[in-house]
């Protein structure tokens, strides 16, 4: 079912509960909220990105099949190596690749820049989104998704890779950020917190949401993920915040109901195909966009992030299932799997709608401090 969301006219950050007051201190990230992964910005992009796959397990895409008409992906784990022993896919189906970067975790050692130098880059993700500072860009048209409503067969690979739960997507899911900006979906995964502790990666004016979904895409200009890593626009991620609502989300339940089967790190199951678009907000026209990086090693930059203004609602029970079912490395619960927000370092976040205009009665004058960088597109 499509979920209700915050008021259509108010930018993210006010929550869908309709609160008027600005976010309080409790909404700001704290030491406990964010994993202790320190990711100091580096002077400049560092080499080595191409060697490491990331964003949980980036699917490594194989060349397009003439018969299938689409890529075959795999999970590249940047954390695990794709086949324990080896494995690449649609290869977005590989969850264990890149042993070189398979040894990382949230919080503690090793520091991510040691795992992948790109993690010390200047244009990293996630970031804090401040709608008032976003540049309204009318050229940002509604996102176009094609082929996201999957039939039940073939089944899809749902895996606990030790850092997230990842659903590998089959060939044929096409997404366009705009004319000539076409992508193919590879995989989706989630980030979450723990009981009473939110776990989204991006924040809005310091507010962290309970969870966040990422749908990772490869530009049609590239046949493989490793070719696209670090290239501007080579990868694109659609991100949406998940928050608590009164009703069960039937689309998410198709995945959440299977988490017990993959509670153990490295375990996986097959789940029926489903409507992937139903996992996203219904409003594809209002979003924030910026260029950043993968949020896990190898932290490759050049990733186009599109963060929906509308949120997705899950029931309290569903959010609890998400944060309290899976296990990660070393007999520890898989929780708080989000990276701390990274400095913008001069980047301007664009908005497809006038997010800087506060629609509440208290706003006397619209505020829009940045102008659209893509005005001529």
């Amino acid at each position: 079912q499509r979920l209700p969301r915050m008021q259509e006219d108010s930018p993210l950050g006010g929550g869908s509960s309709g609160e008027d007051d600005p976010l309080g201190e409790e909404d700001l990230p704290s030491e406990e909220d964010s994993p202790r992964e320190e990711d100091p910005p580096g002077e400049e992009d560092l080499p080595g990105e191409e060697d490491l796959p990331g964003e949980e397990d980036l699917p490594e895409v194989k060349p397009k099949s003439e018969e299938e008409g689409s890529l075959k992906l795999e999970d590249l784990p940047t954390v695990e190596a794709p086949g324990d022993p080896q494995e690449p896919q649609n290869n977005a189906h590989r969850d264990k690749e890149g042993d070189d970067q398979s040894h990382w975790r949230y919080g503690g050692d090793p520091p991510w820049p040691r795992v992948s130098p790109a993690c010390a880059g200047r244009f990293q993700s996630p970031v804090d989104i401040r709608p008032q500072l976003a540049a309204f860009c009318p050229a940002l048209r509604p996102l176009e998704l094609l082929g996201f409503q999957l039939p039940p067969l073939p089944e899809l690979r749902l895996r606990n890779n030790g850092h997230s739960v990842q659903l590998t997507l089959p060939p044929g899911l096409e997404m366009a950020l705009g004319p000539g900006r076409e992508y193919r979906a590879l995989q989706l995964h989630l980030h979450w917190g723990a009981a009473g502790r939110p776990g989204s990666e991006h924040t809005v004016e310091g507010h962290r949401f309970p969870a966040e979904i990422h749908v990772v895409h490869l530009s049609t200009a590239f046949a493989r993920v490793d070719e696209a890593l670090g290239r501007p626009g080579g990868l694109a991620v659609l991100a949406a915040f998940l928050e608590e609502g009164p009703e069960e989300n039937s689309a998410y339940e198709q995945l959440l109901s299977r988490l017990e089967e993959i509670a153990e790190e490295g375990s996986e199951t097959q789940v029926p195909g489903l409507d992937i678009s139903a996992l996203l907000p219904s409003d594809f026209s209002r979003y924030f966009q910026y260029e950043g990086s993968l949020t896990t090693p190898p932290c490759a930059q050049g990733v186009i992030w599109t963060v929906f203004n509308q949120t997705v609602m899950l029931s309290a029970k569903q959010l609890h299932t998400l944060s309290d079912t899976l296990w990660g490395p070393g007999d520890s619960r898989l929780q708080l799997n989000f990276r701390a927000t990274q400095p913008l370092n001069g980047r301007v976040i664009e908005a497809s709608f006038p997010a800087g205009v506060d629609s509440s009665p208290r706003a006397a004058e619209p505020v829009q401090l940045n102008s659209c960088l893509a005005a001529g597109d």
Epitope: P63, N91, Q270
Partner: antibody, heavy 116, light 109 residues
Framework: QVTLKESGGGVVQPGTSLRLSCAAS????????MTWVRQAPGKGLEWVGL????????HYTDSVKGRFTISRDNAKNSLYLQMNTLRADDTAVYYC?????????WGQGTLVTVSS | LPVLTQPPSVSVAPGQTARITCGGN??????VHWYQQKPGQAPVLVIY???DRPSGIPERFSGSNSGNTATLTISRVEAGDEADYYC????????????FGGGTKLTVL
């Protein structure tokens, strides 16, 4: 542990019908697609067909289309293969297996012999 | 009908490495799965998604897939590895969906 057990095989004459069953246990049957695979004596594996988790979608190999029907009863954790108008070249061991894209668990098979 | 071509037989001495190939047009763009079948027994999944091993399968079994050939590699072959091996793909471009190779008989000398 996951267990699949086929039954219903036997010797039948060409043109007749037979219904195979597959009893599943050790997992939530209603969560998974199920597949039938057969193997003629001394030959390789041949995919027969499959059914989605809820029974809404079925696919068959060309040689059995219109003659074989796959169904399931999730309440009984059971999978079925209704075989009509049997031919001599349908003689094989029939396996039920869990999964669609790949088959992670298999039954021990049941032999169907079509002979006059 | 998509065709997956396997050599009918492969022979190897104990302790050596056996490589069983599965050829198909642009098979590297598909996920390949491998099954082992011993006489009188049901098939057993030994490799899935090109190179993943199910729990309980020895690390000696590995797989790769690119271009027009997928390969099942069995290192340090043991007598107990003697069996028939089948590759399999899902092919959504045809009505056949699940396609098996013809099988390869591995003989341990």
């Amino acid at each position: 542990q996951v267990t699949l057990k086929e039954s219903g095989g036997g010797v039948v004459q060409p043109g007749t019908s037979l219904r195979l069953s597959c009893a599943a246990s050790g997992f939530t049957f209603s969560n998974y697609a199920m597949t039938w695979v057969r193997q003629a004596p001394g030959k390789g594996l041949e995919w027969v067909g499959l059914i989605s988790y809820d029974g809404s979608v079925t696919h068959y190999t060309d040689s059995v289309k219109g003659r074989f029907t796959i169904s399931r009863d999730n309440a009984k954790n059971s999978l079925y293969l209704q075989m009509n108008t049997l031919r001599a070249d349908d003689t094989a061991v029939y396996y039920c297996a869990r999964g669609s894209g790949y088959q992670e668990h298999w039954g021990q098979g049941t032999l169907v012999t079509v002979s006059s | 009908l998509p065709v997956l071509t396997q050599p009918p037989s492969v022979s190897v001495a104990p302790g050596q490495t056996a490589r069983i190939t599965c050829g198909g047009n642009n098979i590297g763009s598909k996920s390949v799965h491998w099954y082992q079948q011993k006489p009188g027994q049901a098939p057993v999944l030994v490799i899935y998604y090109d190179s993943d091993r199910p729990s309980g399968i020895p690390e000696r079994f590995s797989g790769s897939n690119s271009g027009n050939t997928a390969t099942l590699t069995i290192s340090r072959v043991e007598a107990g590895d003697e069996a028939d091996y089948y590759c399999q793909v899902w092919d959504s471009s045809s009505d056949h969906h699940v396609v098996f190779g013809g099988g390869t008989k591995l003989t341990v000398l």
